[in-house]
Amino acid sequence: RGVFRRDAHKSEVAHRFKDLGEENFKALVLIAFAQYLQQCPFEDHVKLVNEVTEFAKTCVADESAENCDKSLHTLFGDKLCTVATLRETYGEMADCCAKQEPERNECFLQHKDDNPNLPRLVRPEVDVMCTAFHDNEETFLKKYLYEIARRHPYFYAPELLFFAKRYKAAFTECCQAADKAACLLPKLDELRDEGKASSAKQRLKCASLQKFGERAFKAWAVARLSQRFPKAEFAEVSKLVTDLTKVHTECCHGDLLECADDRADLAKYICENQDSISSKLKECCEKPLLEKSHCIAEVENDEMPADLPSLAADFVESKDVCKNYAEAKDVFLGMFLYEYARRHPDYSVVLLLRLAKTYETTLEKCCAAADPHECYAKVFDEFKPLVEEPQNLIKQNCELFEQLGEYKFQNALLVRYTKKVPQVSTPTLVEVSRNLGKVGSKCCKHPEAKRMPCAEDYLSVVLNQLCVLHEKTPVSDRVTKCCTESLVNRRPCFSALEVDETYVPKEFNAETFTFHADICTLSEKERQIKKQTALVELVKHKPKATKEQLKAVMDDFAAFVEKCCKADDKETCFAEEGKKLVAASQAALGL
């Protein structure tokens, strides 16, 4: 079965049930429902999933049975619309149920919430978790899927199955260990961090497809797969890009059963043809399905073929450039991107796409000129500043990171971004700046050849978080502009923003800077977030404050927290010393 199966199935639900198996079918339906109805209780979702599963089984037994010929969107949408509290819980989302497919599904998709009002997941004690795991393993794992899916409505569903498998393995191993906590907690931390990263990466893919279209996603995929598989032929890369686009379009569109099925087919195809694709796939292809697909998605770049010819000959020096371009624009540009990317694993994907866009723009202009060859002869010279800009930026920021360390580097970014876009909510600025700051420990350790693809493509993922959060409640024209004008120029657009001179400083509110003894019991990370929240608020009150002024206030604040957390009467200390600190800070900043 290729990814493009066109064989007719009387019953789509039976087809997917048979392809995926009952366990994966149920898990994927649960993910789909939780990603659509993010506020519904777990038990309600489980009930709906069981009803759909029982129905699917009747269709497997007889594909001609009543309603078995309905589309999955119709079946799932009808099921979601049976939820009694839809109007009370979701408000206008209930109006989706008055629509017909495909409008109804589009309506549900539009109501997915990137920042749902849900309580933070608190990790119970290890013994409590192990007991719950042993008492009812199936419910325990379903709960994991449900809690992740509802908080991350664009999480890549087949990949979430892989995370759940690792989650189960962690509990199976560690709940029998002598020191359960020492075994389990690092594994859960790793899964949490990897899960957040996976969610953010997939969110960018969906944004790329939904906001900028299939062509934008395909260009991204051509560049990335050409870097990863530089020995593969262009047609092989093109086939993989077409299939990968189908997989991600399905998952981003809520078609999770089709997506998982097609992803499995794609992994099968890649492994059957690995000799024509990459020498690095051997180990991946020996793994079971979920691990195999994950491994392929993360596989390292293959070695570049030796003696690749110069690109200038055919893309610049040839007199046939315009003829070639006119004959088949997308194929010609696709080949340019493929040829450039396979030669440059040291470039970020977004840089490669900027170069391809510059090349396209030049040909559009020059092929209509009196002397096209003379016009486009220097096009490669235009690439130089585009390449140097991210190189210089990464060099400067890695030097700053090495000088400051992660926490203080995050603080520098908090100040920088709050001054650029002070209208953005404080929690969003803290979350995004903290993530931007993680680029240091993630990428600066790499040699030069790996720094740019690591850093700039990671920054694209983080800035997309800012864009999707801002889109929910837009407050800044500058953010909207950087987010919507060009996908590949988002990072340079944000980098180029200076202090927002139009911003009217926020009124001073002493309550914002009032702290209590509960800060002393927080984890180091939570304590950092509290301090960074205060820092953002300070900048919002005094956007013209200098680095030195802000540093002095933050140092005083750190000393104040440390002092009061050591005091016998912590709450009194926080009340009295806090007042002094606020007064001293106001004086220092001239508030």
């Epitope: 032929e233 262009f234 047609a235 092989e236 093109s238 086939k239 043809n273 000799d275 024509s276 073929p305 690749l308 010819p309 690109l311 000959a313 055919d314 893309f315 046939d320 003829k323 070639n324 004959e327 088949a328 194929v331 010609f332 696709g334 080949m335 340019f336 493929y338 040829e339």
Partner: nanobody, 125 residues
């Protein structure tokens, strides 16, 4: 009408060399993919080497890597295959083929759209 005409085949001793040519007419090279395939008696047609007329990237099947070199002259609309260190197992009819770079894959002859009649290469002492 597209025509691909191969030449340069013949009898050669093991360790010897040959240079095959393929003259294309009825279409300009432009953005295309050109390839050499071979078919030994009683065997399936297999890809030997391919080249893009734009970018100039080349691909070879493992058994000929380091021995064969594909090249093209866009101005003459001609494709070449320089074959060195020939072995008896290289004996076959060699075909020139052309197609779209977005489709043509060396391991799959059906992805090439146009074919020549073939030229016989015999490696024997």
């Amino acid at each position: 009408e597209v025509q691909l005409l191969e030449s340069g085949g013949g009898l050669v001793q093991p360790g010897g060399s040959l240079r095959l040519s393929c003259a294309a007419s009825g279409f300009t090279f432009l953005t295309s993919c050109m390839g050499w395939f071979r078919q030994a008696p009683g065997k399936e047609r297999e890809g030997v080497s391919s080249i893009y007329t734009v970018g100039g990237s080349t691909f070879y099947t493992n058994s000929v890597k380091g021995r064969f070199t594909i090249s093209r002259d866009n101005s003459k609309n001609t494709l070449y295959l320089q074959m060195n260190s020939l072995r008896p197992e290289d004996t076959a009819v060699y075909y020139c083929a052309a197609g779209s770079p977005a489709r043509c894959r060396l391991r799959d002859p059906t992805t090439f759209d146009y074919w020549g009649q073939g030229t016989l290469v015999t490696v024997s002492s």
